[in-house]
């Protein structure tokens, strides 16, 4: 079982839209999937949990902060929009 | 050399049932996602079908669903389209295509086989 | 669903000149996209994926590029193999759509 994320460290302007990939090797056909981020205050936060038939977001992620779920792919990707200052974190896609 | 040859086609009356073939050779079949397209008499291309190379995820566009079933041989290397309810806007050039691994862009297609929904 | 809006449908030129051909999907697809030649009677054949990757076998006179909701492929130095006609696909998610296609025609 493995996760990679392709996307390299990026600074983005704020207002834009960044699109964090993750992709996922696995012989369990419903996996459950994570993401998560760690801020410059080195808090620990859940952001996205997904499977095969439904996602959900932390509080803090209504409105801006979505997932792409290409089962086909095996992609969770995570979808950031508008992205503020205080989104800045390192970003980690588990499951 | 990938390899991927359809067969199945033909005349069928509106609401009747077909099954296409594709038989693959060349590669690991059992290895990789497979995809039913279609290209329309005036040359759209649709796609159709897909299913997981195990087997055990496949999916359809809303215009189909219900009406097509995918599967797969893999003993056999073969890919089918099991179709039904059959509608004159099916009536297409239908070719099987073969995926990269975990990805969705068609890496490989066959030479296609007409099917044809008239009265 | 997503669509896509190919343009222009279709496109006569001299071998030798360079074409531009458009795709527009109606979302970002993060340059999940992918084109395709036909030629007439043939199936189609992979040229370019994720965005701007060509296919193994593709001359490099081949081009592609773009990102968000707007892609093209372009081709240099038009050689007569190359006319026929030409197709953009997403793979953001299913369900998987097509441009409408461009037919390039020797003038």
């Known amino acids: 079982d493995k996760v990679t994320q392709s996307s390299p460290d990026q600074t983005v302007a704020s207002g834009s839209e960044v699109v964090l990939l993750c992709t996922y090797d696995t012989v369990y056909s419903n996996p459950d999937l994570f993401w998560y981020r760690i801020r410059p205050d080195y808090s620990f936060q859940f952001v996205f949990y997904g499977d095969n038939s439904r996602s959900e977001g932390a509080d803090f992620t209504q409105g801006r902060f979505s997932v792409k779920h290409i089962l086909t792919q095996k992609a969770f990707h995570l979808v950031i929009s508008p992205v503020r200052t205080e989104d800045s974190a390192t970003y980690y896609c588990a499951f | 050399e990938v390899k991927l040859v359809e067969s199945g086609g033909g005349l069928v009356q509106p609401g009747g049932s077909l099954k296409l073939s594709c038989a693959a050779s060349g590669f690991t079949f059992s290895s990789y996602a497979m995809s039913w397209v279609r290209q329309t008499p005036e040359k759209r291309l649709e796609w159709v079908a897909y299913?997981?190379?195990?087997?055990?995820?496949?999916y359809y566009p809303d215009t189909v669903e219900g009406r097509f079933t995918i599967s797969r041989d893999n003993a056999k290397n073969t890919l089918y389209l099991q179709m039904s309810s059959l509608k004159s806007e099916d009536t297409a050039m239908y070719y099987c295509?073969?995926?990269?691994?975990?990805?969705?862009?068609?890496?490989?297609w066959g030479q296609g086989t007409l099917v044809t929904v008239s009265a | 669903d997503i669509q896509m809006t190919q343009s222009p449908a279709s496109l006569s030129v001299s071998v030798g000149e360079t074409v531009t051909i458009t795709c527009r999907a109606s979302e970002n697809i993060y340059s999940h996209l992918a084109w395709y030649q036909q030629k007439q009677g043939k199936s189609p054949q992979l040229l370019v994926y994720a965005a701007t990757n060509l296919a193994d076998g593709v001359p490099s006179r081949f081009s592609g590029s773009g990102s968000g909701t707007q892609y093209s492929l372009k081709i240099n130095s038009l050689q007569s193999e190359d006319f026929g006609s030409y197709y953009c696909q997403h793979f953001w998610g299913t369900p998987y759509t097509f441009g409408g296609g461009t037919k390039l025609e020797i003038k």
């Open positions: 299913i997981r190379d195990g087997g055990g995820g496949t």
């Open positions: 295509a073969r995926h990269p691994p975990m990805n969705d862009w068609f890496l490989y």
